[in-house]
Structure formats: structure tokens, C-alpha cells
Interface confidence: medium
């Protein structure tokens, strides 16, 4: 028998520095977690103790903090090289700055293979990107070889900016011939490493003949056997065992997100490459693990540029940006409109001639807007200003919801109106009318939504049975501020870009902004 240790991360999202327990900015260092310096300590410890170790990343290193905003992926290549990753799969966020923003900073600079079997380049891009990412890679590990085959969410064109010259194929259809090829090369130990979410990971384990282990990402799935060490609630045991269609037991793993844990999976193979046993658990990278001093020093050196960036002007406002709780928790506020407009703008994807865009709607809890911005400071808007407005380090995510769920959400928005509570919704691509004289749960008297399948966008009545795409803060997608109906009834959830980054990009693009209060939210007293 031959034993392999798989160390894995996924959805690190630019958390190069240690973070608080909830993966936001580290405040009290004695209670902080993760970060590449601490990760390196643990990885090195395991590499020294065990003979056959692979360090793998399942995608979405890009996007999430000011690190990515400033360094645009160069930081990912630099620190992943420093940690000596063995392979990485492409995630959807790796395309956030377009194909060029992937090729130059990461693909050309990485000293490890970057993989995806279901992304096919065409046209002029095919020769430009050739060899910079691969469908699979055979890695020597000790006296053996291990095949790593990559995959990426086929929803990427809707979630990021891969352009028109990359085709995202069905994962299972694309993986099978690559695995078959590895088999013909006498590679009998194969890991599928990819970024399509836990449900697809399980399907790959079930359907793709010859895959021995699946290491996934995208859905931020936390798996754990025994008592979990922090706040995350396990979605299942680690590893999650799937019985394949040909009768094999295939371990599937994922390691939550944000570099908080290091996935640790020990696999035992027989001489024919069959998995005999698999066990392990994610390792919580808490403060009991010291940060490696050389990596930490490097982090501090790179950090200097970030501090300078946060005070630079992004753009100007010629109007007061009213982010006060007195406005945003009671009525339409222009800061809410600005943020929602930025959220929609960030999700413009013209992927279908029938649709002007795939999503037109935004909702945003008023309590998430924490500060106004005064235009009398020469109109200047900086990252620092935006960090005061959006201090929680969240993301703006894409969900799919039924109309009936949206209706419930808007009822919740005003169910205890007048108490300055955070659940009052700011909107984009939505016209809502409330009648506060009616009892809670029955106050939404009109809800019109901007069409997507139209050449001239116009407002249509919400259809209860229809499925809509909506951009919202991850806080709401996770049921925050009492929006349990969103968490319970959402049909799909894809994590998006860092909130501040979305707004700062929009302001930089617009140069001068002047958001108005324009009748998106109205109050009426109806007849009957």
C-alpha cells in the first residue's frame, strides 16, 4: 500500500493576511486565523513529517480584499509560489479581470501547473493561452505518479469576465476523456481538482470513471468528522464518501473558504491504484499555529502599497451620498442606489442576444450601509471612505429566487418599520410600493421588476412563480437580518466580488457620480 497526503485550500479570496474568526479584517491578533504565513508553517510541518504530500488549490484565489484590488493577481502568484503549491484549478473569479488579468499576473508567473479540462480556448486566444493552463498534469510524488485533472464551473460566463473566446464545457463530459488519457499513460491514481461546487463534485465522483479523489471548491463547503473546532457547521463528514456508478468509494473533500482551514486528507492506495482507505479533517489555522517569520516579513513589505492606495482618489461625487441610518433604514437613500447600481454594473454580461443582461435586480439591507460620504471634501472618494460605508468585508453575490421569495423578503423589509432596523431594503432594478397602514406581512402592494429578456428594459409586475436572478450581499444570501426565507428558498447561490471593490470599480469607471433618490421605493395608502 502507498499513502498520499493531500493538503488543500479553496476559495481563499485574497485572504493573504490573517483574519478574524469570521474572515473579516483581523482586529485582535491573538484571536486571528489563517493567512499565508500561518498556512506555510502548517504545510511545512506536514511536509517534514510525512513522505508523500501534495498541496493543491481548488480555485478562487482571486478577489476578496484590497490585496487583489491593488495587486490584481500578482500577489497570488508570488505567495502561492512561495508556499510551493503543487497545482491549482481555475475558479470563476480568476477571470474577474478578463483573460488578460489571468494570463499576465498568474498563468505566466505561476511555477506550478494551473488546470482546467473543461475550458477550451478558440480564435486568436487559443495560441496566446496555449500551454499556460492544462487539462491535467502528472505529478511525481515519491516513487509514484499522481494525475491531477482540473475543472471549472461552467457558469463562469455568468459569474465573471472570461470573454467570448473561452468555451466552458460540461464538467463530466470534458473530464472523462482526460481521465481516460491518463489511464492510457498508466497513471492509476487520479485526483479531480476543481471549482464547480459540492453538488458537482459529488456528481464527478459518481460519474467520471477512474477518478479516485475529488478536491473541490466554489460552494465554500465545510466538511468535518467529529466536533467542529470553530463556528462553521459541517455539511457532512470529511471526507464525504460517494459510491461511484462502477461501485467504488470515492472521497470528496472541500475546505470551507478564506484560508481559515487547511484541508488534510490521507489516502491509502493499493498497488493497482485503488483507494483502500481515506481519512482526515480540515485543520483550523488558529493562533496556536505561529506565522512563518519570512513569509510574514514578505507580507509586511507588500502591505505598504496597500496603505498608500487606500487614501488615493477613486473618483468624485458632486452630491451628498446619504448613507445615514436615518435615511437608509427608513426610505430610499441615494447611497443605497449608488451601491445597487454598482452591483448591477459589476454583473453586466452580454451572453445572449435575447437578454440585455442576465440580471437586473439588486437588494441591499439598509443596515449594511454604515456611513455617508460628504461631497464638500472636494468631492473626493477614497477606498478609505468606502471602507467606512461597507466595513464588513462582504461580497455581492448572485442568487436565483422565486418571485414569491422576493415578495416575502420585501414584506420582511417593513414588517417592523419605524424602529430603525437594518432589514429595510435598498434596491436597484425594482420598484416597490408599501402601504404601512396594513398589517405586517401584507404591506407590499406593488412590486415591479426590470425585465432582462428585452431589448428596451422596462418594469414588469413580479411573477410569483418565475425564477429571478438577484444581486445581494452575502449577508442576505446567508439569511442575515432575519431574511431566513432567502437562505431557505434560494435555488442557486454563487459568491461574488468584494463589496468595496465593486463600488470602487464603479466609481473609478464613472469618474463623477451623482446618484439621486428617484422613486424606487414608495409609500402609499391604498383604497379598499
Amino acid at each position: 500500500a502507498w499513502e498520499l497526503t493531500i493538503l488543500h485550500t479553496n476559495d481563499v479570496h485574497s485572504r493573504l493576511e490573517q483574519t478574524s474568526e469570521d474572515s473579516s479584517k483581523c482586529v485582535n491578533a491573538s484571536r486571528c486565523m489563517g493567512g499565508v504565513a500561518r498556512l506555510f508553517t502548517k504545510v511545512q510541518q506536514i511536509r517534514r513529517a510525512e513522505p508523500n504530500v501534495l498541496l493543491l488549490d481548488a480555485g478562487d484565489q482571486y478577489q476578496g480584499t484590497i490585496w487583489f484590488t491593488v495587486y490584481k493577481g500578482a500577489e497570488v502568484a508570488h505567495f502561492m509560489n512561495a508556499l510551493r503549491y503543487d497545482a491549482m484549478a481555475l475558479g470563476n473569479h480568476e477571470f474577474d479581470n478578463g483573460v488578460e488579468g489571468l494570463i499576465e499576473p498568474l498563468l505566466k508567473e505561476a511555477k506550478f501547473p494551473i488546470l482546467s479540462a473543461n475550458i477550451k480556448a478558440k480564435g486568436p486566444l487559443a495560441s496566446q493561452i496555449s500551454g499556460l493552463y492544462l487539462p491535467y498534469k502528472v505529478l511525481p510524488v515519491g516513487d509514484e505518479v499522481v494525475g491531477i485533472v482540473g475543472y471549472t464551473s461552467k457558469e463562469t460566463p455568468f459569474l465573471s469576465n472570461p470573454g467570448t473566446n473561452l468555451v466552458f464545457e460540461d464538467e463530466i463530459t470534458a473530464l472523462q476523456p482526460e481521465v481516460d488519457k491518463l489511464k492510457t499513460l498508466n497513471v492509476n491514481k487520479i485526483i479531480a481538482l476543481g471549482h464547480s461546487g459540492f453538488e458537482m463534485d459529488k456528481l464527478i465522483a459518481q460519474k467520471v470513471r477512474g477518478v479516485d479523489v475529488v478536491v473541490g471548491g466554489h460552494s465554500n463547503t465545510f466538511l468535518y468528522t467529529g466536533n467542529p473546532p470553530s463556528k462553521e457547521v459541517p455539511a457532512g463528514k470529511y471526507p464525504f464518501i460517494v459510491t461511484s456508478d462502477d461501485g467504488r468509494k470515492v472521497p470528496v473533500v472541500q475546505a470551507y473558504a478564506f484560508g481559515k482551514y487547511l484541508g488534510y486528507l490521507k489516502i491509502e492506495f493499493d498497488e493497482r491504484g485503488n483507494v483502500i482507505s481515506s481519512h482526515g479533517n480540515p485543520i483550523l489555522l488558529n493562533s496556536s499555529i505561529p506565522e512563518d517569520p519570512s513569509i510574514k516579513a514578505d507580507i509586511n513589505k507588500w502591505r505598504i502599497k496597500l496603505d498608500n492606495y487606500s487614501t488615493q482618489e477613486l473618483g468624485k461625487t458632486i452630491v451628498y451620498l446619504d448613507g445615514s441610518s436615518q435615511s437608509c433604514r427608513f426610505r430610499e437613500c441615494n447611497m443605497g442606489n449608488l451601491i445597487c447600481d454598482a452591483m448591477i454594473n459589476n454583473n453586466l454580461r452580454h451572453t445572449d442576444e435575447m437578454f440585455w443582461n442576465h440580471v437586473s435586480m439588486c437588494i441591499l439591507n439598509g443596515g449594511g450601509i454604515r456611513s455617508p460620504i460628504d461631497e464638500r471634501n472636494n468631492g473626493t472618494i477614497t477606498w478609505e471612505n468606502l471602507a467606512a460605508v461597507l466595513p464588513f468585508g462582504g461580497t455581492f453575490d448572485l442568487v436565483q429566487l422565486k418571485g414569491s421569495t422576493l415578495k416575502k423578503a420585501f414584506e420582511h423589509s417593513v414588517h417592523r418599520y419605524g424602529q430603525s432596523t437594518g432589514e429595510f431594503l435598498q434596491v436597484g432594478g425594482i420598484h416597490v410600493v408599501y402601504d404601512l397602514s396594513r398589517k405586517p406581512g401584507d404591506r407590499v402592494v406593488k412590486l415591479d421588476v426590470l425585465c432582462t429578456k428585452c431589448r428596451v428594459p422596462s418594469y414588469d409586475p413580479l411573477k410569483m412563480d418565475e425564477v429571478y436572478k438577484v444581486i445581494l450581499p452575502n449577508f442576505l444570501a446567508n439569511g442575515g437580518d432575519g431574511f431566513q426565507m432567502i437562505k431557505d428558498e434560494l435555488l442557486r447561490h454563487d459568491s461574488g466580488d468584494q463589496d468595496i471593490n465593486v463600488v470602487s470599480t464603479y466609481i473609478s469607471k464613472m469618474k463623477v457620480i451623482y446618484p439621486a433618490v428617484e422613486g424606487r421605493i414608495k409609500f402609499s395608502t391604498g383604497s379598499h
Epitope: V433, K446, P461, S524, H528
Partner: antibody, heavy 125, light 110 residues
Framework: EVQLVESGGGLVQPGRSLRLSCAAS????????MHWVRQAPGKGLEWVSG????????GYADSVRGRFTISRDNAKNSLYLQMNSLRAEDTALYYC??????????????????WGQGTTVTVSS | QTVVTQEPSASGTPGQRVTISCSGS????????VNWYQQLPGTAPKLLIY???QRPSGVPDRFSGSKSGISASLAISGLQSEDEADYYC???????????FGGGTKLTVL
């Protein structure tokens, strides 16, 4: 398939009562307001009554107010029209119709996007 | 008597553009949105236009609605024989606190 099927029509003497029913299928019934609309022989459409998704808002045309009662049973996906003190001028084809919205208010007025085939009510001695 | 009025009949030849109008008051058309329904002979009405000018899915773009002041109109371009039907406008009426239909216009395709 979205469908509305009316029943309960028939021949009735003036002053008597009749109860119309409408069975809904193919959509989430309790998400929408519902209406009764009638059409006298050779005449135009006349809105009779409407009811919001949760029965909190109810409206009637002046011509039937006080005599007709609209109700719904969301558990049974059914709409009803109780017609009392019937008159000859109530003779018509009665349609059940689904609203595009859930409310029965001026602010949420869109229109009726699904109609049944109608049930005939004849009031005659 | 009907509070929203329509001309009883209209006609046109195939391929022609026909306009059907609807007149009301400030309490209905003037202050609220207008719908249009088509009723083919012997069938139930069908929603053609809502919110003055919006077409439900499946309604051809030959049908268009507009509203100005206390009047609304339905235009049918490229008239076809299957467009022969009764057309009704409808609106919310503030003074009646309910919905009102126009008297209907019978469209004949010559």
C-alpha cells in the same frame, strides 16, 4: 398547464341563490388575486368582484354589492361567488380570472392574464 | 352606462394598420394604467396589453398600446384575418374603487 375551470352555473328563478366555483391548477393559487367577470348575451365584459391573495382586500361592482359575496379557499385552490337575490339582469356568462398581481388595489392594478371558459347563469321565471 | 367608452366597431384590410381608441376620465384612464383584452368569437378574453404598453409573453409585437391623458389606444399593424375579434380596454376607477371595462370594439377584417 395553467387552467381555471368554472362550475355551478345554471337556470335559476329571480330572487333565488346560486354558488359559482372556480378550480385553479398549474400555478400557485395563493400567490395571486382573483376575479369574477361576466358577459351578458351579446354584450361587453363587466367586472363583478375581486379578492386579494389572502382575502384581506375584496371589491365589488356597484351592480352586485350587497347581493354577491366572493371568497376563496387557498388550501383547495378554489374561488367562489355566492350570488343571492338574483335578478334577470344577472343573466350572463361568468368568467373566473387570475390577476397578474396579488393585491386588489389601485397601486397594484395590472390585469387578468388567465381566464376560464366561463359558466352560464340564467335568471328567469 | 359605461364610464369608459369605445367606438362600437372598426375595420381594416389585411396588412393595414388599425387603431382602436378608448376614452375615459381622470378617475380611471387619466390616473391609472390601461389594459387591453382580445376576445375571439366564442372564446374567453385574452390579455393583450397591460400597464399601458406592455405585452405579455406570446403576444405578437404587431400589437402595441399607448396612453395620453384620459385616452388610450391599441394599434394593430400588419392586420391579419385572425385578428377579427372584440377588443376591450380596462382600467382601475378611483371613484368606483374597482376595475372597469370599456364597452368593446368589434374589429372586422375586410
Amino acid at each position: 398547464e395553467v387552467q381555471l375551470v368554472e362550475s355551478g352555473g345554471g337556470l335559476v328563478q329571480p330572487g333565488r341563490s346560486l354558488r359559482l366555483s372556480c378550480a385553479a391548477s398549474g400555478f400557485t393559487f395563493d400567490d395571486y388575486a382573483m376575479h369574477w367577470v361576466r358577459q351578458a348575451p351579446g354584450k361587453g365584459l363587466e367586472w363583478v368582484s375581486g379578492i386579494s391573495w389572502n382575502s384581506n382586500s375584496i371589491g365589488y361592482a356597484d351592480s352586485v354589492r350587497g347581493r354577491f359575496t366572493i371568497s376563496r379557499d387557498n388550501a383547495k385552490n378554489s374561488l367562489y361567488l355566492q350570488m343571492n337575490s338574483l335578478r334577470a339582469e344577472d343573466t350572463a356568462l361568468y368568467y373566473c380570472a387570475k390577476d397578474m398581481g396579488w393585491e386588489l388595489l389601485k397601486t397594484s392594478y395590472y390585469g387578468m392574464d388567465v381566464w376560464g371558459q366561463g359558466t352560464t347563469v340564467t335568471v328567469s321565471s | 352606462q359605461t364610464v369608459v367608452t369605445q367606438e362600437p366597431s372598426a375595420s381594416g384590410t389585411p396588412g393595414q394598420r388599425v387603431t382602436i381608441s378608448c376614452s375615459g376620465s381622470s378617475s380611471n384612464i387619466g390616473g391609472n394604467t390601461v389594459n387591453w383584452y382580445q376576445q375571439l368569437p366564442g372564446t374567453a378574453p385574452k390579455l393583450l396589453i397591460y400597464s399601458n404598453n406592455q405585452r405579455p409573453s406570446g403576444v405578437p409585437d404587431r400589437f402595441s398600446g399607448s396612453k395620453s391623458g384620459i385616452s388610450a389606444s391599441l394599434a394593430i399593424s400588419g392586420l391579419q384575418s385572425e385578428d377579427e375579434a372584440d377588443y376591450y380596454c380596462a382600467a382601475w376607477d378611483d371613484s368606483l374603487n374597482g376595475r372597469v371595462f370599456g364597452g368593446g370594439t368589434k374589429l372586422t377584417v375586410l
